[in-house]
């Protein structure tokens, strides 16, 4: 699987999940988020050669087409597959509020 366990341990040029740390205050200007200060959102990147974690028959065909026709611009894209939520804490006045934000952390990628 093209997940953090594999991708973070290997120098993989093809489609894989890559580490990306986002600081809420410095990177996004979200000064009001109290905790966490930031988090690993991660992102997917890298080429999608034939049979590289193909998501659908279409992406398999597209990957094969691109392999056999290297000059063609059409090829599958490396996109998030599994995402996890992130819990944040902020204050409304002096009242703490905890929210779970869905689909915030990329855990694995696929070619689609």
């Amino acid at each position: 699987a093209l997940d953090t366990n594999y991708c973070f341990r290997n120098l993989e040029e093809n489609c894989c999940v890559r580490p990306l740390y986002i600081d809420f205050r410095q990177d996004l200007g979200w000064k009001w988020v109290h905790e966490p200060k930031g988090y690993y959102a991660n992102f997917c990147s890298g080429p999608c050669p034939y049979l590289r974690s193909a998501d659908t028959t279409h992406s398999t065909v597209l990957g094969l087409y691109n392999t056999l026709n290297p000059e063609a611009s059409a090829s599958p894209c490396c996109v998030p597959q599994d995402l996890e939520p992130l819990t944040i804490l902020y204050y409304v006045g002096r009242t703490p509020k905890v929210e779970q934000l869905s689909n915030m952390v990329v855990k694995s990628c696929k070619c689609s």
């Epitope: 996004l28 200007g29 979200w30 000064k31 009001w32 902020y90 204050y91 409304v92 006045g93 002096r94 009242t95 509020k97 929210e99 934000l101």
Partner: antibody, heavy 121, light 111 residues
Framework: EVQLVQSGAEVKKPGASVKVSCKTS????????MNWVRQAPGAGLDWMGQ????????NYNEMFEGRVTLTADTSTSTAYMELSSLRAGDIAVYYC??????????????WGQGTLVTVSS | DIVMTQTPPSLSVSPRETASISCRAS??????????MHWYLQKPGQSPQLLIY???NLESGVSDRFSGSGSGTDFTLRISRVEANDTGVYYC?????????FGQGTKLELK
């Protein structure tokens, strides 16, 4: 230039609902809380609630809880305020106002032009 | 809810004089070393505009004739050398406690 442009005046019957829009430009919509404030004729300002457009988190004033719904469309950078079960006491000018940015609950540095909502049978 | 009480309800000032508006909160609006109190002016037929942020910080583009002071529960907005353009209703606002609340307003007129 930051701009908040609200929809036009509305006339509604008692018991009906009204939905006011606030189209923004000149800043990154998902970076600031959007507040809604109402002002009855000749009266002061009442904070209704707020929404964080990035994921739709909301905080409401209990005075309006259950009747007001705040939403946001990030694709058009537009915020919406819907008020249901309208009554004569809801006749007011409704403002959208951008939060200052340092806190969730904050001062408001940019305001829409206001939308007059009239309730009449 | 924190109740904000402004005095006086209305004020008539001669041009070039100084006007003072008070705002008293029903409980302290101080937290983490800040006073969560702000001031707005609503000119006739217009939307409110932010003048003072966090009790004493002048908002960008606002004349330095406006100044704010105070902490805890008692705050003051001063307008020096009052001009015709300063007429309107002034509001204080706190955001230390949910819900955010405003004062009832002080109407400033020129003599």
């Amino acid at each position: 230039e930051v701009q908040l442009v609200q929809s036009g005046a509305e006339v509604k019957k008692p018991g009906a609902s009204v939905k006011v829009s606030c189209k923004t430009s000149g800043y990154i919509f998902i970076t600031y809380w959007m507040n809604w404030v109402r002002q009855a004729p000749g009266a002061g300002l009442d904070w209704m609630g707020q929404i964080f457009p990035a994921w739709g988190s909301t905080n409401y004033n209990e005075m309006f809880e259950g009747r007001v719904t705040l939403t946001a469309d990030t694709s058009t950078s537009t915020a919406y305020m819907e008020l249901s079960s309208l009554r004569a006491g809801d006749i007011a000018v409704y403002y959208c106002a951008r939060g200052y940015g340092n806190y969730a609950l904050d001062a408001m540095d940019y305001w829409g032009q206001g939308t007059l909502v009239t309730v009449s049978s | 809810d924190i109740v904000m009480t402004q005095t006086p309800p209305s004020l008539s000032v001669s041009p070039r004089e100084t006007a003072s508006i008070s705002c008293r909160a029903s409980e302290s609006v101080d937290s983490y070393g800040n006073s969560f109190m702000h001031w707005y002016l609503q000119k006739p037929g217009q939307s409110p505009q932010l003048l003072i942020y966090l009790a004493s910080n002048l908002e960008s583009g606002v004349s330095d004739r406006f100044s704010g002071s105070g902490s805890g529960t008692d705050f003051t907005l001063r307008i020096s050398r009052v001009e015709a353009n300063d007429t309107g209703v002034y509001y204080c606002q706190q955001n230390n406690e949910d819900p955010l609340t405003f004062g009832q307003g002080t109407k400033l007129e020129l003599k």
